[in-house]
């Protein structure tokens, strides 16, 4: 069995920030899980991380350098990603695993999200260099 | 048949760090199944440090998280297992084993006795 | 975490006795009418081996004389009639949520 995975097929950043909604054929109440977010075709970039416990607060966390925070619904968790920059417009998968109470379930590969970033220009750190100038 | 065997243990100084490796074979860690890292102190009960899926999300104990990591080379189907900052209640023996559907452990290596001592 | 506490901690028997060991949870470890309790013999200087898993279904190539019962909170593991071999201690565990906890174990050691 597999869980079943929507997002919405594309989304625009106008201010450098989107919510971006996953939402599953699961209910996850009461379950410990993983829920992560993944930029590109090859989902090469773990953009998010969301830990469900069922004693804890939500674990949020990026290891990738993006700004992300998150929010848990009964069959939902939505990823809000702020500062992206306009060379980040891509295609984003959520992915989910869920681990206890067994048995363990994942989800079959959604078909994603293109966000297509159209903010304003940030001027990106030393970690996220821009296009460089001639 | 699966067939699990750990190695890397031996005497380490308090403070120091310890990579214990456990080779399977007869079956792909990246399979279907997950993989998880179980002590036992002398004369003691047995103590769960954490797991690895086959997907490669970990999960661990919370009494050990800051210090533990759990890894695994796919091409040498090879679990390993990191602890830092070692003290003497560390000192144990160290099991791999397989979890099966309903996350009992099926599979056991044999055990790797560590022991942290000056 | 789930504390599992058994009881007893240890115990005296003969060859041919029945014994029973009992595993209490500090709370359910059922879900959707399947109770992650297991339940393992360990011998010195070896690695533990399953004997029971989900509370009731004897592991493959486990004699028979074994036996688990028990839903909820409340779990026994029975030996229906003790051979030599097994004179061991056991434990139980659930695997209901994280931490994944042990019970203190069960020496069954000879009259």
């Known amino acids: 069995n597999k869980i079943l995975v929507k997002q919405s097929p594309m989304l625009v950043a106008y201010d450098n920030a989107v919510n971006l909604s996953c939402k599953y054929s699961y209910n996850l109440f009461s379950r410990e899980f993983r829920a992560s977010l993944h930029k590109g075709l090859d989902s090469a970039v773990e953009v998010c991380v969301v830990y469900g416990n069922y004693s804890q607060q939500l674990q949020v966390y990026s290891k990738t350098g993006f700004n992300c925070d998150g929010k848990l619904g009964n069959e939902s968790v939505t990823f809000y990603l702020q500062n992206l920059y306009v060379n980040q417009t891509d295609i984003y998968f959520c992915k989910i695993e869920v681990m206890y109470p067994p048995p363990y379930l994942d989800n079959e590969k959604s078909n994603g999200t293109i966000i297509h970033v159209k903010g304003k220009h940030l001027c990106p750190s030393p970690l996220f260099p821009g296009p460089s100038k001639p | 048949e699966v067939q699990l065997v750990e190695s890397g243990g031996g005497l380490v100084q308090p403070g120091g760090s310890l990579r214990l490796s456990c080779a399977a074979s007869g079956y792909s860690i990246t399979s279907g199944h997950h993989w998880s890292w179980i002590r036992q102190a002398p004369g003691k009960g047995l103590e769960w440090i954490g797991e690895?899926?086959?997907?490669?999300?970990?999960y661990y104990s919370p009494s050990l998280k800051s210090r533990v990591t759990i890894s695994r080379d796919n091409s040498k189907n090879t679990l390993y297992l990191q602890l830092n900052s070692l003290r003497a209640e560390d000192t144990a023996v160290y099991y791999c084993?397989?979890?099966?559907?309903?996350?009992?452990?099926?599979?056991w290596g044999q055990g790797t006795l560590v022991t942290v001592s000056s | 975490d789930i504390q599992l506490t058994q009881s007893p901690s240890s115990l005296s028997a003969s060859v041919g006795d029945r014994v029973t060991i009992t595993c209490r949870a500090s709370e359910s470890v059922d879900f959707y009418g399947i109770s992650f309790l297991h339940w393992y013999q360990q011998k010195p200087g070896k690695a533990p081996k399953l004997l029971i898993y989900a509370a009731s279904t004897l592991q493959s190539g486990v004699p028979s004389r074994f036996s688990g019962s028990g839903s909820g909170t409340d779990f026994t593991l029975t030996i229906s009639s003790l051979q030599p071999e097994d004179f061991a201690t056991y434990y139980c565990?659930?695997?209901?949520?994280?931490?994944?906890?042990f019970g203190q174990g069960t020496k069954v050691e000879i009259k």
């Open positions: 084993a397989r979890k099966d559907d309903y996350y009992a452990f099926d599979y």
């Open positions: 565990q659930q695997s209901y949520r994280t931490p994944i906890t």
């Open positions: 690895i899926y086959h997907s490669g999300s970990t």
